[in-house]
Amino acid sequence: TPEVWVQVQMEATELSSFTVHCGFLGPGSISLVTVSWGGPDGAGGTKLAVLHPELGTRQWAPARQARWETQSSISLALEDSGASSPFANTTFCCKFASFPEGSWESCGSLPPSSDPGLSAPPTPVPILRADL
């Protein structure tokens, strides 16, 4: 069964910068990836980026850069302009549309240990590479 993984990281150097990593583990050709925050797109979530393998990417603030990491994984850099760092408690969702199998989605948030209030910066967790 295909799976989607989501990992949210806070940049160690800049506490206002976050990166969402998403990957698809399954067959078929990925046709579209939709990233949203605050819940799934269509269920109260707000669309942050749409990535198409051929037609490119489209993103909306506060998304800074959306890009393909591999044929089956993407990353989305976010710039948190607010001092309160709302991203820390936000859910990010990734939906992969793979033809002809269909769509799979998953959500994730910043691990509690990555709280910006902690003195030590978070240690980045190794990203699972779907292409290995």
């Epitope: 078929g28 050709s29 269920a43 198409h52």
Partner: antibody, heavy 120, light 107 residues
């Protein structure tokens, strides 16, 4: 203007074979996933085959698996459906349709259909 | 396969009425639902995608809502030209499946 034109339908005997064609024009055919959808005499719509834009991935529901084969010729801008071991329940109007990635795989263009009647 | 149960099967309305069609999926289909209109003697035409997005040229009297398993399609102020069969479809998991259709007739 996007145009899909099906052909190849007709009257065929039980257990027989038929090959349907769908000529596409007005868009870059090789950039789109395509499907065959049939409409039964009771007017129900049913997906019978799907093929990815690169032609590497195909899908068939259990009702036609092993009997139908979908293929595409991007040089000729044509979609095909090879049907064999035809059953009476395959009697339907067969539509060729185009999937739009940005519309969540909704089918944004359909042909006019070609009729297939399986008789005993 | 995901079953899309569409109700009602028939609707007899007057021009100017408001019409609501519902579609229930046998499991969650996220927001991957489309609605089609099929006029007599024609092929189906896409009206709505991703539940609530109108396809090019579709009048704003057509609206859609829902998420997960329950979806609603509404025609505000029905017009004579809306005489057709309407189908919902899930494009979440293959095989893409359709509702049984709702035949809209104008009094």
């Amino acid at each position: 203007d996007v145009k899909l034109v099906e052909s190849g339908g007709g009257l065929v005997k039980l257990g027989g074979s038929l090959k349907l064609s769908c000529a596409a024009s007005g868009f870059t055919f090789s950039s789109y996933h395509m499907s065959w959808v049939r409409q039964t005499p009771e007017k129900r719509l049913e997906l019978v085959a799907a093929i990815s834009r690169d032609g590497d991935s195909t899908y068939y529901p259990d009702t036609v698996k092993g009997r139908f084969t979908i293929s595409r010729d991007d040089a000729e801008n044509t979609l095909y459906l090879q049907m064999s071991s035809l059953k009476s329940e395959d009697t339907a109007l067969y539509y060729c349709s185009r999937h739009e990635d940005y519309f969540g795989f909704a089918m944004d263009s359909w042909g006019q259909g070609t009729s297939v009647t399986v008789s005993s | 396969s995901i079953v899309m149960t569409q109700t009602p099967k028939f609707l007899l309305v007057s021009a100017g009425d408001r019409v609501t069609i519902t579609c229930k999926a046998s499991q969650s289909v996220s927001n991957d639902v489309a609605w089609y209109q099929q006029k007599p003697g024609q092929s189906p035409k896409l009206l709505m995608y991703y539940v609530s997005n109108r396809f090019t040229g579709v009048p704003d009297r057509f609206t859609g809502s829902g998420y997960g398993t329950d979806f609603t399609f509404t025609i505000n102020t029905v017009q004579a030209e809306d005489l057709a069969v309407y189908f919902c479809q899930q494009a979440y998991r293959s095989p893409w499946t359709f509702g049984g259709g709702t035949k809209l007739e104008i009094k």
